[in-house]
Every structure is written in C-alpha cells, then in structure tokens.
Interface confidence: low
C-alpha cells in the first residue's frame, strides 16, 4: 500500500469548478 | 444538510485588515469552488472571484486585485476572504456561494457586513 | 468581462398578472452545448437565492410559477402569476467567462 504522503501517482476525483471554472470532470493533482 | 455559515459583522477603521471565514457543512469541501460576493449598501451583486478548493488556488476579478485574498482552511471546511487596507468603499455585505455544477451558486452564506469609518 | 443588462431596473406588476425580466450579455455565454446563465431572487437583509439555472432548469424547490428561457445573449425570466411573496430584486447571472451578475430588477406590486 502507498503511504499517505506519497505524491508519485495522482489523485483523481470527479469534481466541479476544479479543472476548469464551471465545468465538472474527473481532477487530478499530484 | 448543506450549510455555509459566515462570522459575524465587522466594524474597522480606514487601514486597518479584516479577515472574514465562511464554514461549510453537509458535503464534501473540496468538491466544489466557492465564490466571494460583493453588495454595498443598496447596491448590486458584484463578483469578487473565486477559490478552487481542490486546489486552493485563487481567481480574483478585475476590481478586486491587491488588497484582497482568498484562503483555505481544509481541515476545518473553512474558507476566508481577508480585506487589506480597508476603504470606506469596502463597506458592504459579503457573501460566501457554493459553486455548482454549471457555475451556478446553489447555496450561500448569511452574509457579512463590514463597516469601514473612521 | 461579460457585461450583463437588465431590463427595466424596476417594474410594478399586480397580482396574478405576468413578469417579464430581460437580460441581454455583450457577448454569447453558450458553451459545451449549454447556455452558462442564472437567475436569483434577493429580499432585502437576505443572500440570493437560485430560482433558475442554465438558462431554463427549475430549481428544486421553486414554484413552477417561475419559468426561463433564452439562449446566446438573450435571455428572459418570467414569473406567472406574480404573488406577493415574489416583491423582491432579480438578478441574472453568467458563469461562461468568470462571473458577472446583471445590475437587478426591483419587482414591486401595483
């Protein structure tokens, strides 16, 4: 298992606004 | 439910700073940008910018570069808009708004009066 | 920035009659296939509240007496029959480009 602080892979979440303002879609950030 | 509550009502002199919080409740925090909103008295609507609270970067709108910012406190589902340099024209209601889908802003803060004088 | 006009400024209407609110946007606010604009109603001491979103979508909760429609720079809020409780002032709202809101419309009762 990953450890909490590892930043290697990304996280992925459906979100609104994150990627792009007003839109919703999977984000993701390192 | 879903619920962003804002402090209480402000009142400061010209120059000085003010830092006001809005609390969230009832969802994910980091799943939707929140929105800052500008009415002086009698006034309009005026959009000030917005947080990405996945990211926590900010956007602010033309008229409001400089002397305001934007922040997060993610742990506590706590957004805050803090006001530099205070003007007698910063004295007006300020809002908190949930983005939503489509960029519309579904649920709202109470509100938070500052009353810049001297 | 978008800038949103709407139109009249204030309009006195009597009960059960029709409300029509215009609000026309320097440029399109239609993207992806939808059209990026809202409306709120605001009572005095309260935050707005949404009454329509994407240009004609109800939101839950809102009296069907409330109805939008529009596409582009155009847009309309009509409010049908008009009851006293609807005394308030009407915004609309563009998330196309940013934000901007429209400079309202105070709905009195004639």
């Known amino acids: 298992r990953r450890r909490r602080r590892d930043t290697h892979f990304p996280i992925c979440i459906f979100c609104c606004g994150c990627c792009h303002r007003s839109k919703c879609g999977m984000c993701c950030k390192t | 439910q879903i619920q962003l509550v804002q402090s209480g009502p402000e009142l400061k002199k010209p120059g000085e700073t003010v830092k006001i919080s809005c609390k969230a409740s009832g969802y994910t925090f980091t799943t939707y940008g929140m929105s800052w909103v500008k009415q002086a008295p009698g006034k309009g609507l005026k959009w000030m910018g917005w947080i990405n609270t996945y990211s926590g970067v900010p956007t602010y709108a033309d008229d409001f570069k400089g002397r305001f910012a934007f922040s997060l406190e993610t742990s506590a589902s706590t957004a805050y808009l803090q006001i530099n340099n205070l003007k007698n024209e910063d004295t007006a209601t300020y809002f908190c708004g949930r983005d939503h889908y489509y960029g519309e802003v579904a649920y709202w803060g109470q509100g938070t009066l500052v009353t810049v004088s001297a | 920035d978008i800038v949103l006009t709407q139109s009249p400024a204030s309009l006195a209407v009597s009960l059960g009659q029709r409300a029509t609110i215009s609000c026309r946007a320097s440029?399109?606010?239609?993207?992806?296939?939808?059209?990026?604009m809202h409306w709120y109603q605001q009572k005095p001491g309260q935050p707005p509240k949404l009454l329509i979103y994407?240009?004609?979508n109800l939101e839950s909760g809102i009296p069907a007496r409330f109805s939008g429609s529009g596409s582009r720079t155009d847009f309309t809020l009509t409010i049908n029959p008009v009851e006293a409780d609807d005394v308030a002032t009407y915004y609309c709202h563009q998330s196309n480009e940013e934000y901007t809101f429209g400079g309202g419309t105070k709905l009195e009762i004639k």
């Open positions: 440029e399109s606010v239609d993207s992806y296939g939808n059209s990026f």
């Open positions: 994407r240009a004609s």
